[in-house]
Interface confidence: medium
């Protein structure tokens, strides 16, 4: 395993009062490997509402870099391939679990927490408001 | 807190050689609450690859309940509102991290797993196969 | 850049173990883990296993279960591999190379090496 | 294990000339193929990830795709650097796996 210098505030994980704390076996379980999904590789430039995917970096948390998504454009790719700005490109969210590692530097203590990411684009048909 | 009948086959924590184990805090921090995201709510109706929400529930599973997203149609809608099989509504797919009980039934020992969600969907232009 | 400088060249015998370093600088050690891969003389490249340094998770190849050995230190930024009972199939050039903690596209997923150490030159003969 | 087969293991060639080497898995895996150069004795270095990006400072000759099962590596216009092995690499479901290599050498 790792050997990690550790914080001298961290917690004693045989403390009761520990707050709502479990123990985790780290030895990811990949629940997909039977299935053989068919990927999400080339959506990213195939869709009519493309994405670029950006970095985001954080050294105490698990995963370390997660790419974000971020639509191309405001409006969707039509039939001649140009950008329709009767539609629009909007980016599909959800909530992920990390591990971040706290008290920072304990080599055995995390929490969960839940971050939203930009996993893709679709193309939407867009609210129009009439002002009266 | 919820009560779960204890397996008399549950590790103890304070095993020292519980495999690749750590304390995990489940007071679950969420990072989005500042940022009041736009919510991708109604998308899933009004996107050109629309999409159904189906409830996957597993109770010994961290999040218990996960919506997936299932494509309503083979093609995406086009302007006049019928489904165009030229184009193709493919489902934009995403791994979560969820802690999975192990041995099941144990209150307070998990394992961390992937699974591969679908998130919504995307309208793609079709990988055409020429036969020579 | 990330850097990544291996230890020297070993000479072993039949049975003997064997443990190389991998010093990594530039970067956040923990945001990445650490591969070996080795290269037999005039083959191609074979992946023995894998520690992620954010919490020290490890995987090995098959092959190599029960005969590898591959741990981290945080504080000299450092990774090593032991390799147990080598025979003269394990003489090889083993390199470390860097493997970053990403979610792609919507993937938590072992990923590309983007960074090597120079090599260690490893060879077991009686 | 997933079996990664390049093809050709070697190919000869003239400077400014397209080289295409190719690479087939077993099962499908998604994207996540990568590329590497290795020059006699020295370490591979990263070319291509996740089949079709470049990776920093690499040549913008060099390029790949596909997705599945079946990849391609592209050299637009070979220089004589370009001279090495070429592997590809999956990282999808461990063992990671490596294909055979294919010898690149200049005319």
């Known amino acids: 395993g790792i050997t990690i210098p550790r914080n001298p505030g961290c917690p004693n994980s045989e403390d009761k009062n520990f707050p709502r704390t479990v123990m985790v076996n780290l030895n990811i379980h990949n629940r997909n490997t039977n299935t053989n999904p068919k990927r999400s590789s080339d959506y990213y430039n195939r869709s009519t509402s493309p994405w670029n995917l950006h970095r985001n970096e954080d050294p105490e948390r698990y995963p370390s870099v997660i790419w974000e998504a971020k639509c191309r454009h405001l409006g969707c790719i039509n039939a001649d391939g140009n950008v329709d700005y009767h539609m629009n490109s909007v980016p599909i969210q959800q909530e992920i679990l990390v591990l971040r590692r706290e008290p920072p530097h304990c080599p055995n203590s995390f929490r969960l927490e839940k971050i939203l990411v930009s996993v893709g684009c679709t193309c939407v048909t867009p609210i129009v408001h009439h002002v009266a | 807190g919820i009560t779960i009948p204890r397996n008399p086959g549950c590790p103890n924590s304070e095993d020292k050689n519980f495999p690749r184990t750590v304390m995990v805090n489940l007071n679950i921090h969420n990072r989005n609450t500042n940022t009041n995201p736009k919510r991708s709510s109604d998308y899933y109706n009004r996107s050109t690859s629309p999409w159904n929400l189906h409830r996957n529930e597993d109770p010994e599973r961290y999040p218990s309940v996960i919506w997936e997203a299932k494509c309503r149609h083979l093609g995406c809608i086009n302007a006049d509102g019928n489904v165009d099989y030229h184009m193709n509504s493919v489902p934009i797919q995403q791994e979560i991290l969820v802690l999975r009980r192990e041995p099941p039934h144990c209150p307070n020992s998990f394992r961390l797993e992937k699974i591969l969600v679908s998130v919504g969907c995307t309208c793609v232009t079709p990988i055409v196969h020429h036969v020579a | 850049e990330v850097q990544l400088v291996q230890s020297g060249a070993e000479v072993k015998k039949p049975g003997e173990s064997l443990k190389i370093s991998c010093k990594a600088s530039?970067?956040?050690?923990?945001?990445?883990?650490i591969s070996w891969v080795r290269q037999a003389p005039g083959q191609g490249l074979e992946w023995m296993g894998g520690?992620?340094?954010?919490?020290?998770?490890?995987d090995y190849a098959q092959k190599f279960q029960g005969r590898v050995t591959i741990t981290a230190d945080e504080s000299t930024t450092t990774a090593y591999m032991e390799l147990s009972g080598l025979t003269s199939d394990d003489t090889a050039v083993y390199y470390c190379?860097?493997?970053?903690?990403?979610?792609?596209?919507?993937?938590?997923?072992?990923?590309?090496?983007?960074?090597w150490g120079q090599g260690t030159t490893v060879t077991v003969s009686s | 294990e997933i079996v990664l087969t390049q093809s050709p293991d070697f190919q000869s060639v003239t400077p400014k000339e397209k080289v295409t080497i190719t690479c087939r898995a077993s099962?499908?895996?998604?994207?996540?193929l990568h590329w590497y150069q290795q020059k006699p004795d020295q370490s591979p270095k990263l070319l291509i990830k996740y089949a079709s990006h470049s990776n920093p400072g690499v040549p913008s000759r060099f390029s790949g795709s596909g997705s599945g099962t079946d990849f391609t590596l592209t050299i637009n216009g070979l220089e004589a650097e370009d001279a090495g092995t070429y592997y590809c690499h999956q990282s999808d479901i461990l063992p990671q796996t490596f294909g055979q290599g294919t010898k690149v050498d200049i005319k």
């Open positions: 190379a860097r493997e970053p903690n990403e979610f792609w596209n919507g993937y938590y997923t072992t990923h590309d090496f983007d960074a």
């Open positions: 530039g970067g956040s050690f923990r945001s990445y883990g």
């Open positions: 520690i992620t340094n954010f919490f020290g998770a490890v």
């Open positions: 099962q499908d895996i998604g994207a996540a």
